[in-house]
């Protein structure tokens, strides 16, 4: 078979002329190889220069082919986290807004006056969700403790409160016995039900982000001197063969590609941290409705005034008792008794049907909806990396032409030795290139911990808790459906079977690099847009 | 393999509310990533996806539906179903249950039934 | 929601033929497209998925290709068992949608 391979380098200057390479270093026929430090040293048409040159670029075209094959992961990742991101911060100014609005509506210029608490709240609640701020069971403390300094003196406006009185008060509020209870259990309440969500939805936008950080380092693969020589011998030399249109064996690409990315895959971790954000987005859009606890922020604060309102002889009488008899307002300083109005009224908040949506049209649902459709293309990618690369037609012949003679590595032929899978103790005998069977690189590891960390806190997140330290299931009950949820994770929300795989595809570039990614097969990776 | 089975009234008056059943055999309705979906096809006019409920409890409507329609799973039973109410002669087609995965086409499908809004 | 336009809405083509029907999506779709065949008093059956990817069990001679907004779906040479209405359908973004559908008929 190797009488048929040219003696004529016609093929290699065409090709490596058109690359930019001086024609005066390609030889118009073969020459003696001896020279070669890679390629067999037969007959070529390299020289040493042209050999260094393309072991460069063929390392060039690996690492930019698996680049290309994950940046539809990149870009998914990140826009699906932009999306998230703005869609939270946006639900929680839309909250803050409707509670202005229902709030001045409600208790007109008492509102007005004592606004800067409310604000106060959401701002820190932003703080929580954007990693920045302290815990939310102390904001939420203050915050109700703020709000009883502001509102206890407006029910008894024949008494002075001076300021150790109210921070007797404040602090009688948030003693841990519980013994006063001025809002009734509405603090506790939205405590839960605030902490349950914001701490899913930063965990949610967190393992996004994590996710999109962790794949593109993961891309940038780093080439060995052992992978680097195989690549050579894959797809440069051919060219120093002096047939550049013989397309390596698809057995050998595989074999090649799988020992250079032998310690680099991300899998099972991948699978999980895939799992954990679907099950987490799940919750978000379910029982922790990070729409519903928006909305009902206002709502809870309302209910707790007006308990207070309605027990204030009760609870007036045990701070009285606690703090002792505060001292009257001498009568012509009295104020008069506010309106009965601005005293606060029942007030109930008016429940839409429709979703909250935001300003840009959307709502958790649709997001939710779209997140799943393309966190399906992700499934399996690690795994299938490999068969993306060798889809490339610079890589290797169609896989389709099993038959058909190809580059062997040492001419035109079938490729006899073994394929090797892709496992560390596969890869012990991969025939190609010698491969560490230690297992995955430190940096890989490094990437794994942090997905797994990742899965960690979303895992954690989902069934109503904080890895950091603070607990939101403290009445399980929750909105519903806890249980099943516990399930579902362990069961791991399982990939329905595997089609068939299709032809991997060369990658696919616009010009905002939002598109692209490698071949895929249904039900599991492929192609997809970055939103 | 999965099959679908759409059963219900092949008749119903207008204003009333249309309930199709569709039974799943091969599969558990319970399983993980799956969307369980209702399409509609009008007598000689195209497809129209009504809605579809997630193996979660999550449900997908068609907005132009949304109002009339509600779409359930009994997993004890291994099936799904759909109500439309207050239908009206624009809602006489050919009513389709399907199976949907993430990412992926419907497939399988049930063999369809034709309810007819007729008084 | 998302616009599917197809065409033609019917043609007529002789055994042997290679046909071509087209559909637009009214915004970027990616690749998140299928395509369909529907014969009469049937439920619909997946050809292509993900535009351009044959599915396990359908004959060679059909194949889809696009991305973005415009997609083909061709035969590449015409069979009696063909003769159908042929449906494309976006999958990006909520509510599904669609295309009106293309009826193929042999001359």
């Known amino acids: 078979s190797e009488a048929k391979v040219t003696r004529s380098c016609a093929e290699t200057r065409q090709v490596l002329g058109a690359r930019g390479y001086s024609l005066n270093l390609i030889p118009p026929a073969l020459i003696s190889g001896e020279h070669l430090r890679v390629c067999p040293q037969e007959y070529t048409c390299c020289s040493s220069e042209t050999e260094q040159r393309l072991i460069r670029e063929t390392e060039a075209t690996f690492r930019g082919l698996v680049e290309d094959s994950g940046s539809f992961l990149v870009h998914t990742l990140a826009a699906r986290h932009r999306k998230f991101d703005e869609f939270f911060l946006e639900m929680l100014s839309v909250a803050q807004h409707s509670l202005t609005q229902l709030f001045s509506h409600s208790y007109g210029r008492l509102y007005a006056q004592h606004a800067l608490i409310f604000n106060g709240l959401f701002s820190r609640l932003r703080d929580f969700y954007g990693e920045s701020g302290e815990g939310l069971d102390d904001t939420l403390a203050d915050f109700w403790a703020q709000l009883l300094e502001r509102v206890f003196p407006l029910l008894h406006p024949q008494y002075s409160f001076p300021p150790d009185y109210l921070l007797c008060l404040s602090r009688l509020a948030s003693s841990t016995d519980g013994s006063l209870q001025p809002f009734g259990d509405s603090p506790r309440r939205l405590r839960l039900q605030i902490t349950r969500t914001l701490v899913a939805a930063r965990a949610f936008v967190q393992g996004l982000e994590t996710g999109r950080n962790v794949v593109s380092e993961a891309l940038k693969v780093p080439v060995s001197e052992g992978c680097s020589q195989a690549l050579m011998r894959l797809i440069g030399c051919p060219l120093c063969r002096g047939v550049p249109s013989l397309m390596p064996c698809q057995g050998f690409c595989l074999n090649v590609v799988r020992g250079c990315l032998s310690s680099r895959g991300l899998e099972p971790d991948w699978g999980n941290y895939l799992d954990g954000l679907l099950i987490l987005a799940d919750k978000l859009q379910g029982p922790f409705s990070f729409e519903l606890t928006a909305e009902s922020i206002g709502v809870k604060i309302s209910e707790g005034l007006m308990y207070l309102q309605e027990n204030s002889a009760k609870v007036s009488a045990q701070v009285f008792q606690e703090c002792g008899p505060p001292d009257p307002v001498p009568a012509r300083n009295r104020r008069a008794p506010p309106p009965r109005e601005e005293a606060g009224r029942l007030w109930s908040m008016v429940t839409e049907e429709e979703r909250p949506t935001t300003a840009a049209g959307t709502n958790l649902h649709r997001l939710v909806w779209e997140l799943r459709e393309r966190l399906a293309r992700m499934r399996g990618f690690w795994a299938r990396l490999s068969l993306t690369v060798c889809g490339d037609s610079r890589m290797a012949a169609d896989a389709s032409l099993e038959a058909a003679p190809c580059w062997t590595g040492a001419g035109r032929g079938r490729y006899l030795p073994p394929v090797v899978g892709g496992s560390p103790a596969e890869q012990v005998n991969n025939p190609e290139l010698k491969v560490d069977a230690s297992g995955p690189d430190v940096p890989t590891r490094r990437r794994r911990l942090q997905l797994r960390a990742a899965t960690a806190r979303m895992k954690t997140a989902a069934l109503g808790h904080d890895l950091d330290g603070q607990d939101a299931d403290e009445d399980a009950s929750g909105s519903g459906g806890g249980q099943q949820y516990a399930d579902d994770w362990m069961a791991g929300a399982v990939a329905p079977p595997a089609r068939p795989p299709r032809p991997p595809y060369p990658p696919r570039r616009d010009g905002s690099g939002g598109k692209g990614g490698g071949g895929s097969a249904r039900y599991n990776q492929g192609r997809s847009r970055s939103g | 393999q999965l099959q679908l089975q759409e059963s219900g009234p092949g008749l119903v008056k207008p204003s009333e509310t249309l309930s199709l059943t569709c039974t799943v055999s091969?599969?558990?309705?319970?399983?993980?990533?799956?969307?369980w979906s209702w399409i509609r096809q009008p007598p000689g006019k195209g497809l129209e996806w009504i809605g579809s409920?997630?193996?979660?409890?999550?449900?997908y409507y068609n907005p132009s539906l949304k109002s009339r329609v509600t779409i359930s799973v009994d997993t004890s039973k291994n099936q799904f179903s759909l109500k439309l109410s207050s239908v009206t002669a624009a809602d006489t087609a050919v009513y389709y249950c399907?199976?949907?995965?993430?990412?992926?086409?419907?497939?399988?499908w049930g063999q369809g039934t034709l309810v007819t809004v007729s008084s | 929601d998302i616009q599917m336009t197809q065409s033609p809405s019917s043609l007529s083509a002789s055994i042997g033929d290679r046909v071509t029907i087209t559909c637009q999506a009214s915004?970027?779709?990616?690749?998140?497209l299928n395509w369909y065949q529907q014969k009469p008093g049937k439920a619909p059956k997946l050809l292509i998925y993900?535009?351009?990817n044959l599915e396990t069990g359908v004959p060679s001679r059909f194949s889809g290709s696009g991305s973005g907004t415009d997609f083909t779906f061709t035969i590449s040479s015409l069979q009696p068992e063909d003769v159908a209405t042929y449906y494309c359908?976006?999958?990006?973004?909520?509510?599904?949608?669609f295309g009106q559908g293309t009826k193929l008929e042999i001359k």
């Open positions: 993900d535009a351009s």
């Open positions: 915004q970027d779709i990616s690749d998140y």
């Open positions: 359908q976006q999958y990006d973004n909520l509510p599904i949608t």
């Open positions: 091969g599969g558990s309705i319970s399983s993980s990533s799956y969307y």
């Open positions: 399907a199976r949907r995965v993430s990412g992926h086409p419907f497939d399988p």
């Open positions: 409920i997630y193996y979660s409890g999550s449900t």
